[in-house]
Interface confidence: medium
């Protein structure tokens, strides 16, 4: 066995093992997505998190899982069976993924102001229509999760929520905000978190009430809601995690480049090995 053959053999099994790992990972992601879709309540109790945007994540996880499994399967079978067409397809898929990421990166860096404004518009629309439309629960859950995780409330200010007519205080009643705005660590008073499910929400039936984010909390006189708007919160989060984000993106990009290089190298050199082997037969 020549050095080239052993090198190709090493690449072949390296690609197979790594893609097998990604196939298993993809199937796990897919299973989680399906689990959330089928049984949300058991997943929430398993994860133990409040305000998880399950509706979006179930679909995102399921699609990502299938996509990861698909690419990994191409790499696995293509490498193990030494099938040029599958390895070529594997390379093509990775190239497409890599090109998409590069394009996204360029778009994000050049169109930052427009993206920020688009995000603000989406958030404003979500806030304005909060709790009134059963079809909008995915966006609402996601925004609740952002508020909960970033410890912020509203876009510019918590008062953004007071623009929503169904959340406005009436007479002696306090204004209301989603419970994801509450700073649970700032208060020991459990009465503050007595939920106020609005009549408008109750008309939506179990669909609205079953999800955590439809819970509306009254703002007490000395409020325990997050004081910071999420625009500042997001900026802080991006600033604090910029190195990590760039690192992960670079890591994923380099990993893709590595697999692309190996797959195309294996694909191009399979012919030479077959030709050499044919002479010995």
């Amino acid at each position: 066995m020549s050095a080239q053959e052993s090198c190709l053999s090493l690449i072949k099994y390296f690609l197979f093992v790594f893609n097998l790992f990604f196939f298993v990972l993809g199937s796990l992601i897919f299973c989680f997505g399906i689990w959330i879709l089928i049984d949300k309540t058991s997943f929430v109790s398993f994860v133990g998190l409040a305000f998880v945007p399950l509706q979006i994540w179930s679909k995102v996880l399921a699609i990502s899982g299938i996509f990861t499994m698909g690419i990994a399967l191409l790499g696995c079978v293509g490498a193990l069976k030494e099938l040029r067409c599958l390895l070529g397809l594997y390379f093509g898929m990775l190239l497409l993924l890599f090109a998409t990421q590069i394009t996204l990166g360029i778009l994000i860096s050049t169109q930052r102001a427009q993206l920020e404004r688009s995000l603000r518009d989406v958030v404003e629309k979500t806030i304005q229509k909060y709790g009134t439309n059963p079809e909008e629960t995915a966006a609402e859950e996601s925004w609740d999760y952002v508020q909960f995780q970033l410890r912020c409330c509203g876009w510019h200010y918590p008062q953004d929520w007071f623009q929503v007519l169904i959340l406005r205080g009436n007479g002696s009643e306090a204004h209301r905000v989603p419970c994801s705005c509450y700073n649970l660590s700032a208060t020991n008073d459990s009465t503050i978190l007595d939920k106020v499910i609005l009549p408008q929400l109750s008309r939506l039936g179990h669909l609205a009430r079953s999800r955590h984010s439809a819970d509306i909390c009254a703002v007490p006189a000395e409020s325990h809601i997050y004081r910071e708007g999420c625009a500042q919160g997001l900026q802080k989060w991006l600033h604090n995690n910029l190195i990590s984000i760039v690192g992960i993106c670079l890591g994923v990009g380099l990993l893709e480049l590595g697999f692309m290089t190996l797959s195309i190298f294996l694909c191009r050199n399979l012919d030479h090995v077959y030709n050499r082997l044919a002479r010995y037969r």
Partner: antibody, heavy 119, light 107 residues
Framework: QVQLVQSGAEVVKPGASVKVSCKAS????????MYWVKQAPGQRLEWMGY????????TYNQKFKGRVTITRDTSASTAYMELSSLRSEDTAVYYC????????????WGQGTLVTVSS | DIQMTQSPSSLSASVGDRVTITCKAS??????VDWYQQKPGKAPKLLIN???TRHTGVPSRFSGSGSGTDYTLTISSMQPEDFATYYC?????????FGQGTKLEIK
Amino acid sequence: QVQLVQSGAEVVKPGASVKVSCKASGYSFTDYNMYWVKQAPGQRLEWMGYIDPYNGDTTYNQKFKGRVTITRDTSASTAYMELSSLRSEDTAVYYCARSPYGHYAMDYWGQGTLVTVSS
Amino acid sequence: DIQMTQSPSSLSASVGDRVTITCKASQDVSTAVDWYQQKPGKAPKLLINWASTRHTGVPSRFSGSGSGTDYTLTISSMQPEDFATYYCRQHYSTPFTFGQGTKLEIK
């Protein structure tokens, strides 16, 4: 920190126009609307209109419509208010103030620009 | 246009006094009311928005309440720096309108 710095005092003749500027700093200029408010001596505050610096959309008080024009220069983070066909009752202090949305409070104000209409 | 009528137009008070300023709208403005403080030669300063929410950095002695057409600004214990003119404003519908102001003077 957030700052709104307005141009200096102006003395103009009746029938002429005046353009007051308001330079914003310490925040993302396109993220907040810019209001213009008039305060004539001994009078209540009067809302003139506002601009959304992101797209240039304007909303005016009908009372000033046709005479007031609000514009912006995003590259300079500056909003402008031009008032034409000036008359003596336009003698006032003009304030710019930022607001996150149209229907919202004005959380930061400029120092004001005194415009005196006198022949 | 929605008219905002403030009362009283002027008021004399002493340091430590509890002061209440009222603002009546000509129609329901659904808590879309702000309160501003203005000192001579200075720009107005936001105190309260959405009828009852204190703006960042505003002392807790200032409080707002009300709904429908009637709104109040209360200063629980007057301080020397609180002597100024106070304005209410509705941002429920355009044109946004201000009250005529309440001038707080030292007794």
